[in-house]
């Protein structure tokens, strides 16, 4: 049975969508900035009709590896999923590898496509640049995600976000629209535009199919 809760906001995305939040856990974001990033993710989640039938979410913090806090198949109340998202720990790592997290998204999160009717989106929140040695297979992973029809939306935050990688992602598919922000302070201003963009990429649920009419028996 679907675990639903009443909407918290006027705008509420009720579409068929698998959405993955990928949070940069590098020290390029201070602990305070990471708090703002988490608040943004939770705010976004409040505007989605989260359930196994409508919008499924995953939340991953990435540094030199990836740490999944929520999986797409987690059957929990939306409020509990938001609580878990708010508990994402600040890693403050030297490195946050976008290549590694896209590889994780490709081979772990979207290894099997169990909802072909839903749109698949990875929201890549990035504030840093991985070392070149780590980015050798970056394009391959972006292309792999494209093959699986996973849209990648990069959100560059602050002066250290890897603009070269953002442009590479954008080049792979027209839907891969980037949002480039000068700081985390702009996340709240851009939130509704980002949610609207994601929501518009996802299909509405088809109307329920009615059983065929029973043959009328006339006496």
């Amino acid at each position: 049975e679907d675990i639903s809760e009443p909407p918290l906001h006027d705008f509420y995305c009720s579409r068929l969508l698998d959405l993955v939040f990928l949070l940069d856990g590098s020290s390029r974001l201070s602990e305070a900035e990471f708090e703002v990033l988490k608040a943004f993710v939770v705010d976004m989640m409040e505007r989605l009709r989260i359930s196994q039938k409508w919008v499924r979410v995953a939340v991953v913090e990435y540094h030199d590896g990836s740490h999944a806090y929520i999986g797409l198949k987690d059957r929990k109340r939306p409020s509990e999923l938001r609580r878990i998202a708010s508990q994402v720990k600040y890693a403050g790592s030297q490195v946050a590898s976008t290549s590694e997290v896209l590889k994780y998204t490709l081979f772990q999160i979207f290894s099997k496509i169990d909802r072909p009717e839903a749109s698949r989106i990875a929201l890549l929140l990035m504030a840093s640049q991985e070392p070149q040695r780590m980015s050798r297979n970056f394009v391959r992973y972006v292309q792999g995600l494209k093959k699986k029809k996973v849209i990648v939306i990069p959100v560059g935050i602050g002066p250290h976000a890897n603009l070269k990688q953002i442009r590479l992602i954008e080049k792979q598919a027209p839907e891969n629209k980037a949002f480039v922000l000068s700081s985390v302070d702009e996340l709240e201003q851009q939130r509704d535009e980002i949610v609207s963009y994601l929501c518009d990429l996802a299909p509405e649920a088809p109307p329920p199919t009615l059983p065929p009419h029973m043959a009328q028996v006339t006496v």
């Epitope: 201070s30 602990e31 305070a32 708090e35 608040a39 939770v42 508990q87 403050g92």
Partner: nanobody, 126 residues
Framework: QVQLQESGGGLVQAGASLRLSCAAS????????MAWFRQAPGKEREFVVF???????LYSTSVRGRFTISRDNAKNTVYLQMMNLKPEDTAVYYC????????????????????WGQGTQVTVSS
């Protein structure tokens, strides 16, 4: 178990300054994100300011530019320098700490903090 003790409150005129202190007992203080909240009479407790273990800060819009938070890990103390005080700043000010080893949360929510002080009263008269 961490104990927090606020001090420095009092009665001042509008436009004056005050410095609140929050002394913490217990180990690992330097790794704890800290915050100040306040509760005005008849109102709910509200977030004022946050300071991370890395000294990074977040301010509520109502105090930005007037209040400054800092921490001295050697003294296990967090300070709140309040300038250009207004009558609407009148409240009980609470210090809060989060044990980041096993808890996290959203910085402006009370439920994100594990330890609380008893509060210190700040009254600003016009």
């Amino acid at each position: 178990q961490v104990q927090l003790q606020e001090s420095g409150g009092g009665l001042v005129q509008a436009g004056a300054s005050l410095r609140l202190s929050c002394a913490a007992s217990g180990r690992s203080f330097s790794s704890y994100p800290m915050a100040w909240f306040r509760q005005a009479p008849g109102k709910e407790r509200e977030f004022v300011v946050f300071i991370g273990s890395d000294h990074s800060t977040l301010y509520s819009t109502s105090v930005r530019g007037r209040f400054t938070i800092s921490r001295d890990n050697a003294k296990n103390t967090v300070y709140l320098q309040m300038m250009n005080l207004k009558p609407e700043d009148t409240a009980v000010y609470y210090c809060a700490a989060r044990n980041s080893a096993w808890s996290s949360g959203i910085y402006y929510r009370e439920t994100s903090y594990d330890y609380w002080g008893q509060g210190t009263q700040v009254t600003v008269s016009s």
